[in-house]
């Protein structure tokens, strides 16, 4: 019964495909993936951004966004909890929300940028739920109705798991986007050796390269604080 | 303004069931989150649950888990408490509060409060 | 669950004085407290969110402050109208839970 439940809510989602907006359901404490699909051909060059909707009017306030380097965009970011990677060959933005608290829940957009502009890809609610047992399984998510405000709106089929530490789910993709990184690394050094030798200079002491594969600088952003109708 | 308007007291014999609604008007019903707070007498305060109408999906103080439902009906503005299997000692003013959040859709600071319905539980 | 332990149970004060009401949590609730008053008969009032923020139409006089587990709710000068309940309560977790309450009662 249960996988045949999962089925027709994959199926729902699956029609439901072209809504404004997407429910993703999690649980407090653990983790949240969201994903946001897109034209990779249409959108390609640009880096991506995640942001939280202050209000029903107002401005989408940046949480997190991809690396600086479109290439690198595969690259994990994190701000705080919040974790961003971009498959830009396979079109998909996936952001990470660890430690899942009621505070999460929310509007939230996934968007496309380009100079100051920013398209947005999906529109995202977030659900959290209290406990796992709480909560019948996926058969009995909520979908919205004739009546709900969110007429636009379906529910995600992927709720909430926990994330291994230190588990990184990179697309197939990125990982041919990581071996040529590395593959113009060795490039690069190679090359650098080579002019070193040419030019009698001692090797090791080659040019630093703008690659950075492994490591991912990210930054913090500083968090507003809540608006409120008091 | 937003306004939280409760149903009457109730008088309810142990191991029944009793269902209090409390109204919105005045603001967005949708998107903030109701709580709902009992009070026993001379007692503290204490959460038993909320909901946010747009998610339809309740969450739960544990002490309450499988004999309170939390409801909303968004076309009248309207969430539900119902809890079953009444003791004595659920005796107590119950409120409904709304949470004064505007992106967070948990903010927790419950800014609007009903009148509060007192609910006696007594053979 | 967060445990929230407020101190003194009972505070005796004259108008005009200041009065300070602590409460304790038993874990990390971030800055996500609020302060509520309520006065016999009637529902609790909102006065205090996320730590330290007055909710409208609340008068200066009432200032929150603290973060993590120590928060404190200072009223500078009381007034006749402001003997009553006060109940602090977290909203980091679910269950959101309430502390036991502290009574300010003139003397």
């Known amino acids: 019964m249960e996988p045949l439940r999962l089925l027709i809510l994959l199926f729902v989602t699956e029609l439901s495909g072209a809504h404004n907006t997407t429910v993703f359901q999690g649980v407090a404490g653990q983790s949240l993936q969201v994903s946001c699909p897109y034209d990779s051909m249409k959108h390609w060059g640009r880096r991506k951004a995640w942001c939280r909707q202050l209000g029903e009017k107002g401005p989408c306030q940046r949480v997190v966004s991809t690396h600086n380097l479109w290439l690198l965009s595969f690259l994990r970011r994190w701000n705080g909890s919040t974790a961003i990677t971009d498959d830009t060959l396979g079109g998909t933005l996936t952001i990470t929300l660890r430690n899942l608290q009621p505070h999460d829940a929310g509007l939230y957009q996934c968007q496309s940028l380009h100079g100051s502009e920013a398209d947005t890809l999906r529109k995202v609610l977030v659900e959290v739920l209290a406990d796992p047992l709480d909560h019948r399984d996926a058969g009995d998510l909520w979908f919205p109705g004739e009546s709900e405000s969110f007429e636009d709106a379906h529910v995600e089929h992927s709720i909430s798991r926990s994330l291994l530490e230190g588990e990184i789910p990179f697309p197939p993709t990125s990982i041919l986007l990581l071996l040529a990184c590395i593959f113009l690394i060795k490039i690069l050094a190679a090359s650098a050796l080579w002019a070193a030798a040419w030019h009698g200079q001692k090797p090791g002491t080659h040019p630093p390269s703008e690659l950075d594969c492994g490591h991912d600088p990210g930054y913090q952003l500083q968090t507003l604080p809540g608006l409120r109708d008091t | 303004q937003v306004q939280l308007v409760q149903s009457g007291a109730e008088v309810k014999k142990p191991g029944s069931s009793v269902k209090v609604s409390c109204k919105a008007s005045g603001g967005t019903f949708s998107s903030y989150a109701i709580s709902w707070v009992r009070q026993a007498p001379g007692q503290g305060l204490e959460w038993m649950g909320g909901i946010i109408p747009i998610f339809g999906t309740a969450n739960y103080a544990q002490k309450f888990q499988g004999r309170v439902t939390i409801t909303a009906d968004e076309s009248t503005s309207t969430a539900y408490m119902e809890l079953s299997s009444l003791r004595s000692e659920d005796t107590a003013v119950y409120y409904c509060?709304?949470?004064?959040?505007?992106?967070?859709?948990?903010?927790?600071?419950?800014?609007?409060w009903g009148q509060g319905t007192l609910v006696t539980v007594s053979s | 669950e967060i445990v929230l332990t407020q101190s003194p149970a009972t505070l005796s004060l004259s108008p005009g004085e200041r009065a300070t009401l602590s409460c304790r949590a038993s874990?990390?609730?971030?800055?996500?407290l609020a302060w509520y008053q309520q006065k016999p008969g009637q529902a609790p009032r909102l006065l205090i969110y996320d730590a330290s923020n007055r909710a409208t139409g609340i008068p200066a006089r009432f200032s929150g402050s603290g973060s993590g587990t120590d928060f404190t709710l200072t009223i500078s000068s009381l007034e006749p109208e402001d003997f009553a309940v006060y109940y602090c309560?977290?909203?980091?977790?679910?269950?959101?839970?309430f502390g036991g309450g502290t009574k300010v009662e003139i003397k």
């Open positions: 509060a709304r949470d004064s959040g505007n992106y967070d859709y948990w903010s927790g600071a419950l800014r609007y």
């Open positions: 874990q990390s609730v971030s800055s996500y």
């Open positions: 309560q977290q909203s980091s977790n679910w269950p959101w839970t």
